[in-house]
């Protein structure tokens, strides 16, 4: 903490300007009025203060606003934001997307810090849901943001926000997250026709159940192997050879290269060898002819 000392004569700051960089820490504390600092925060960023000097400025704002800074100040924090702790940020009430953007800009190019995570959490909670504009902003700064949310948090994402999601934003999502996002994508894109719909829904199909994959197989979609390999194994297993052939279209030949990997490997084990042979790809490992196949899916579903 900086000691309380009187401001030397003639050094009282009339405005926030470059002359202040020559002030010692104790002079800043004594000579800069906190209310003046608050009204001229937008100037701080343009002045090359040292980290120690920024600590003093933060201390002055903390004293002026013990319950948390007003948004008019927060929006112009600039590099002073990097000095904030998550505890400081939890006191804030950030409602403007412009404020959020301004602060994310300060942290641009870095990993998401605890401060940024807290800021985003406060912002989203304040809004009540993760709307499209917010998601647009967050994924622009942090492409993996969506996949950092829990399934419970993702449940509050409105379908319209899904329009802002790019395929790369889903790269690190696990199946539980896609289970939540896929139904929302279905809702969001339901007014689109077949071919357009498939282009949009493709990235979310890792959360699709068997019924939807069967329905897609009737649409001549020609799913590529990369997408097929990301499907849920339990959703792929019940598909017939004919359905997989329709689903993949000309890409069905790619199954041979993937026959040792899930979900293809597990799917092959569930098919009759006779049926696999109709593909003419040399896929091996199916149920031999003459064997009785018991459908245990009913039991699995009930257990």
């Amino acid at each position: 903490e900086v000691e309380k000392t009187a401001c030397p004569s003639g050094k009282k700051a009339r405005e926030i300007d470059e002359s202040l960089i020559f002030y010692k820490k104790w002079e800043l504390e004594a000579c800069v009025d906190a209310a003046l600092l608050a009204t001229q925060m937008d100037r701080v960023n343009a002045i090359p203060f040292t980290y120690e000097q920024l600590d003093v400025l933060k201390h002055k704002l903390d004293e002026l606003y013990p319950q948390g800074y007003p948004e008019s100040v927060i929006q112009h924090l600039g590099y002073l934001f990097l000095k904030m702790s998550p505890e400081d940020i939890r006191k804030w009430n950030v409602t403007s997307l412009e404020t959020l953007k301004a602060l994310l800009e300060v942290n641009k190019g870095h990993e998401m810090s605890p401060q940024v995570a807290t800021l985003i959490d406060r912002f989203v909670k304040g809004r009540g849901q993760l709307d499209k504009d917010t998601l647009d902003t967050l994924t622009a700064f942090y492409p993996g943001y969506l996949c950092s949310l829990s399934p419970e948090e993702l449940s509050s994402v409105p379908p319209s926000s899904i329009w802002a999601v790019r395929p790369q934003d889903l790269d690190t999502c696990d199946p539980r997250q896609l289970d939540v996002l896929y139904p929302k994508a279905r809702l969001a894109f339901q007014n689109m026709n077949g071919s357009e719909y498939f282009v949009k829904i493709q990235s979310f199909l890792g959360g699709a159940p068997t019924e939807d994959l069967k329905a897609l197989s009737q649409q001549n979609v020609s799913m590529d192997l990369a997408t097929f390999m990301k499907l849920r194994t339990d959703a792929v297993l019940p598909l017939t050879v004919a359905e997989v052939q329709k689903l993949l279209g000309p890409h069905v030949e790619g199954l041979k290269a993937e026959e040792r990997h899930r979900p293809v490997r597990d799917w092959i084990l569930r098919q009759r060898q006779d049926d696999l042979d109709t593909l003419g790809l040399g896929l091996q490992g199916g149920i031999p002819n003459g064997y009785l196949v018991l459908d245990l899916s009913m039991q699995e579903a009930l257990s």
């Epitope: 289970d179 894109f189 019924e211």
Partner: antibody, heavy 122, light 106 residues
């Protein structure tokens, strides 16, 4: 034949909560998307939200956000809709409606419950 | 918020054609559904995705949708078709129902 059977009529005081159930009978092995729609006396239909087959994903109409919760008990093929902080204007018949038709972008309300009248009165 | 406007009532003689309109901004860009509701009963889906009929719905029910208007047409209207009819679309995070049209068979 597939049927959706809803819980009985309820009378609630303002500020209270109500939980309406909707049980599928018939083809209970398969699970489907379930909508909830309400209809105030003499008024039109109003969509409240939807829950997906596994119950992990819900989408609520903005108007009910924060007041409505939809859940699903897959073991009993029952879906629940809870509405909190009730006010007199929530007096309505509440319907569950299941999406039975297939189609990747299909959400038609194919099978409807008989409706549950919820009366909010002090 | 998105609004769908329907005429409050439509009257038709038995055997004639009843047309119910549903108006909304750029409605033709969305898929429209239609629901029939008889007094004291739950609604029934009669048309989905503009012009498709669920199984069990008579062929006399048909639909179209373009521009700002979706239309439900009941050709050869029967007394049993007397009911309220609601159009419905998905728009920005919600399903929107039309104001409803009471069809009276004279």
């Amino acid at each position: 034949e597939v049927q959706l059977v809803q819980s009985g009529a309820e009378v609630k005081k303002p500020g209270a909560s109500v939980k309406v159930s909707c049980k599928a009978s018939g083809d209970t092995f398969k699970r489907y998307y379930m909508h909830w729609v309400r209809q105030a006396p003499g008024q039109g239909l109003e969509w409240m939200g939807i829950i997906n087959p596994s119950g992990v994903s819900t989408t609520y109409a903005q108007k009910f956000q924060g007041r409505v919760t939809m859940t699903r008990d897959t073991s009993t093929s029952t879906v629940y809709m809870e509405l909190s902080s009730l006010r007199s204007e929530d007096t309505a018949v509440y319907y569950c409606a299941e999406v039975r038709g297939s189609g990747f972008n299909y959400f038609g309300m194919d099978v409807w419950g008989q409706g549950t009248l919820v009366t909010v009165s002090s | 918020s998105y609004e769908l406007t329907q005429p409050p009532s439509v009257s038709v003689s038995p055997g004639q054609t009843a047309s119910i309109t549903c108006s909304g901004d750029k409605l033709g860009d969305k898929y429209a559904s239609w629901y029939q509701q008889k007094p004291g009963q739950s609604p029934v889906l009669v048309i989905y995705q503009d012009n498709r009929r669920p199984s069990g719905i008579p062929e006399r029910f048909s639909g179209s949708n373009s521009g700002n208007t979706a239309t439900l047409t009941i050709s050869g209207t029967q007394a049993m078709d007397e009911a309220d009819y609601y159009c419905q679309v998905w728009d920005s995070d919600t399903y929107v129902f039309g104001t409803g049209t009471k069809v009276t068979v004279l």
